[in-house]
Structures are given as structure tokens and as C-alpha cells.
């Protein structure tokens, strides 16, 4: 399934390539990337009714058209559900050992820069992606993944670490962002919202998606994460938005079906190996890329973010399971575990495809506002 564009329908790309139509120019957030109504209970603010999108922010509802079994970022989803009237007591602080440096949480104290000064850096993540302002970089080739189809044995550790659910990945999962840009996958984790409240970390034109998966990689130039932290390109994260669809996602079900076992913070279980690439969109050729940071303390910068243009479809029940099963500290549900979008501060998001070119009948001249910085790579 894929949703039509927020503007008016326009034809798909030529031939059988199944190419997608980019987002329109209307309703772009402000240049400054300042927090919008959809911004989360990140380190700055607690969740509240003001975090909900206003009616004027809601895209109009369009019927679905037949195509591939996942959405595209250009085709923004329909309406956001109304907010949860009851505020989740998200990540209430369990102060077992005083205000230790590592005791950060989503929303409220301590401010993240006090936990780690890097959290006040100029090039932080997540960010709001505005396809119209993305620089089309033909040099950005399709991502290459090798060894991501894991056998059932050895089993993998799935853990509720109090901030997210994390799957530890074994050695041998290789990923290349391009020639000479090689990485090894270390772990994956998810970010989500609460009932009726989306919880992706990145946003697209201010729109927040239900959830987001992050697959974290270490550059092969480094032997350990410590060495790579803060170094440009030392870490790379593949990110994809999770969206509601009509069918159960069998790949995700292998993980979601085990969440009850790790409902308690700090608990873990073993799950059979699975095809990790099946948790990601199928189109590895169309993505956005920028340099940012870890989205949790210590917020180290230099992280290469690759955000897929295509989204992954989960059923409504699966999204509910994700957001309503795990518990965090202080006997509170683990929900709304996403950071507020951060200012770009002059960064240009690159796109592997002409995301800013509007092919709809309304656009007389294609517009590309930024040029590719990586053309010579």
C-alpha cells in the first residue's frame, strides 16, 4: 500500500521503475527548524496536550492506491490520531544512586547537557527533514548490506534497557554507505509514542510518524565504539519510519511477540536470529543523509544518519504492542521515547534522489534549493 501525495495525485515515474513522487512545497515548517507542536518530550519539555498537532497541521485524507507494500516519505500519511487525554508518567526518575551522570530520561530533569555537554552541540539529531531543501546527490549510491540474513542460531539478546528495546547483533553484519565507507552493524532499537500519539524521532515537514527503527553501525576504521564517538563518520545509523498498514509485518512480529517477556526495565530474553534486512524498507536506493549525533546522551556528534525514503508497514495491533507493552523506570510505561527535533544550524540534508523536484502539474519549474556537497565523493 502507498498513500497519495498530500497535494494532488500525479503519475508515478516512468516505466516499471515504480519511482515515487516527491513532497510538495506547501506547509513547510520554518527554516529555523524550531520545535513544533509535534515535538516530543525530549530533554526540553514534558509531554502534554501542547505536543499534539493542531488541526491545521493535519494533511487531508486521501484514498490509498495499489502499489508496493510500504509507504514513501513523499506520500505523507493521513491524519494523526487525537492525543491521549491521560498523560503518561513517562520515565519517572528512579533515583537509586543519586543524580548520577548516566541517569538521564525523556522529559524533565536533569537537562541533557548536564548529563553530557555534547547534547548542547550545534549538529545534533534528530532533525526535521524538508525534502524541498534537500540537496540531490547522484553520488549517493544504493546502500549495500551483507550478512543481515541471520540463521535462527545463535540466538540474539533482546533487552528492555529502560530507554528502548534493543536487539544486540552478532559480528558479521556489514553495511556500506558507498565505496570506502564500510561499517559493521552492532545493534538495533526502536523509538515510539503512545496511544494515538506518534513517536518517530525524525520528522518530515513537521510530520511525526508512529515509530522509527535505528540500526547502529561502527565504522570498520575503528575497533571500538569509544574510539569512534565524536569522530566524523565513526558511527552510522540506518533509520526508517514505521507506519500503520493493513497487514501484520511478519519480520517485526518475531520481535514484538517477545516484548511481554521483557516488560520490566532491565529484563532480557533470547530470540532466534532473523533477517535483519526485512526490518528495513526494501528500497535501499532512495534515502536522505546528513551528519548529526546520537539522539540520547552522550549525544556524540559525527554520526552519519541515513533515513530511508520508504517506510515500513506494521499493523495497528503491532504498533499498539510496541507502545503499550514495556515498562520504564518508576513503574511507568516506556512510551514517547523520542527526542525533540534539533536545529540544522546550516547543515544541508542530502538526498540520493531528486526529492525536492516537484513533478505535479502545479510546478512549472522543478525547484532544487541546495546543491550537492558530496558530488566529488
Amino acid at each position: 500500500q502507498r498513500l497519495p501525495r498530500m497535494q494532488e495525485d500525479s503519475p508515478l515515474g516512468g516505466g516499471s521503475s515504480g519511482e515515487d513522487d516527491p513532497l510538495g512545497e506547501e506547509d513547510l515548517p520554518s527554516e529555523e527548524d524550531s520545535p513544533r507542536e509535534e515535538d516530543p518530550p525530549g530533554e526540553e519539555d514534558l509531554p502534554g496536550e501542547e505536543d499534539l498537532p493542531g488541526e491545521e497541521d493535519l494533511p487531508e485524507v486521501k484514498p490509498k492506491s495499489e502499489e508496493e507494500g510500504s509507504l514513501k516519505l513523499e506520500d505523507l500519511p493521513t491524519v494523526e490520531a487525537p492525543g491521549d487525554p491521560q498523560e503518561p508518567q513517562n520515565n519517572a526518575h528512579r533515583d537509586k544512586e543519586g543524580d548520577d551522570q548516566s541517569h538521564w530520561r525523556y522529559g524533565g530533569d536533569p537537562p541533557w547537557p548536564r548529563v553530557s555537554p555534547a547534547c548542547a552541540g550545534r549538529f545534533q539529531s534528530p532533525v526535521d527533514i524538508r525534502p524541498q531543501l534537500a540537496a540531490f546527490c547522484p553520488a549517493l549510491r544504493p546502500l549495500e548490506l551483507l550478512g543481515f540474513q541471520l540463521p535462527p542460531l545463535p540466538e540474539l539478546r533482546l533487552r528492555n534497557n529502560g530507554h528502548s528495546v534493543q536487539l544486540t547483533l552478532p559480528p558479521g553484519l556489514e553495511m556500506a554507505l558507498g565505496p570506502g565507507r564500510e561499517y559493521r552493524a552492532l545493534q538495533l532499537h526502536l523509538h515510539w509514542g503512545a496511544a494515538g500519539r506518534p513517536g518517530s524521532e525524525h520528522t518530515v515537514e513537521g510530520h511525526r510518524f508512529p515509530a522509527e527503527i535505528h540500526v547502529v553501525h561502527l565504522s570498520t576504521a575503528f575497533a571500538r565504539v569509544d574510539e569512534a564517538l565524536g569522530r566524523p563518520g565513526g558511527l552510522a545509523v540506518l533509520a526508517a519510519f514505521l507506519e500503520e498498514g493493513p497487514e501484520e509485518n511478519s519480520a517485526y512480529e518475531q520481535l514484538l511477540s517477545r516484548l511481554e517477556e521483557i516488560a520490566e526495565e532491565g529484563s532480557e530474553t533470547q530470540v532466534p536470529g532473523l533477517d535483519i534486512s526485512a526490518l528495513l524498507p526494501s528500497d535501499f536506493s532512495r534515502y536522505f543523509q546528513y551528519e548529526g549525533s546520537l539522539t540520547t546522551p552522550p549525544c556524540a556528534q559525527g554520526v552519519i544518519w541515513t533515513v530511508f525514503n520508504q517506510t515500513v508497514m506494521l499493523s495497528a495491533k503491532q504498533l499498539h504492542t510496541l507502545s503499550d507493552t514495556l515498562w520504564g523506570p518508576g513503574d511507568s510505561r516506556l512510551q514517547l521515547n523520542f527526542r525533540a527535533t534539533q536545529p540544522l544550524n546550516g547543515r544541508v540534508i542530502e538526498a540520493s534522489f531528486p526529492a525536492g523536484v516537484d513533478s505535479s502539474p502545479r510546478a512549472a519549474e522543478p525547484v532544487q534549493l541546495n546543491s550537492c556537497l558530496a558530488a566529488g565523493d
Partner: nanobody, 114 residues
């Protein structure tokens, strides 16, 4: 790799106590979930206890009430106090540090025998 150095293993009589320690050489120690796992001959490695960055602890049912895990972020050390030891606690005990990466120590032998 992140260096995890275990110590404190040895031979102890049933009902006795041991304290295992693990020191990590990592600048991101505070953000790690730390754990102890064990592997007896012919068995798979199994969870003993973990402690998150927020000092939330989790224990295997078989050691609850007998073992206590703790961490000292300043010293970059995670410890496992093992009381009322039983012969079935005999195994190689491994220290684990997990955050972005997943790192293991070399293991220390614990033998409970009379």
C-alpha cells in the same frame, strides 16, 4: 576492543561466598548496561544478573536472594556478590558491557565443591 577484566573467582565450599569484580576500560561506562553471565560445561551461556545505566537490576530466578550485582561508575567496576553458593553455581562467569557495542570479558572460573 573494550577491555573487561574479571577477578575474584575461585574454589569455595557450598554455602560459602565469593565476590566477583569486573573493571572496564571505556569512556562510556556510565551509559553501559553491565551484566554477569555464566556457562557451565556442556551448557549455553546464561544470564546471572544485569544492572542498567540507571542501576536497575535484573536477576535470573536461580540466583535471586543470593546474588547481588552493583556498579561503581567512578571506578568503572561492576561487582557480583555471591552468597549461599551451591554446587550448581559452578561455571565460568563472564562480565558483559552493552550499550552501542557488546563486549565480553575472558571469564573467571567459580567452583563450588566440598
Amino acid at each position: 576492543q573494550v577491555q573487561l577484566q574479571e577477578s575474584g573467582g575461585g574454589l569455595v565450599q557450598p554455602g560459602g561466598s565469593l565476590r566477583l569484580s569486573c573493571t572496564a576500560s571505556t569512556s562510556s561506562f556510565n551509559f553501559q548496561t553491565l551484566g554477569w553471565y555464566r556457562q557451565a560445561p556442556g551448557n549455553q551461556r546464561e544470564l546471572v544478573a544485569t544492572i542498567t545505566s540507571r542501576a536497575i537490576t535484573n536477576y535470573a530466578d536461580s540466583v535471586k536472594g543470593r546474588f547481588t550485582i552493583s556498579r561503581d561508575n567512578a571506578a568503572k567496576t561492576v561487582s557480583l556478590q555471591m552468597n549461599s553458593l551451591k554446587p550448581e553455581d559452578t561455571a565460568v562467569y563472564y562480565c558483559n558491557a552493552a550499550w552501542i557495542g557488546d563486549y565480553w570479558g575472558q571469564g573467571t572460573q567459580v567452583t563450588v565443591s566440598s
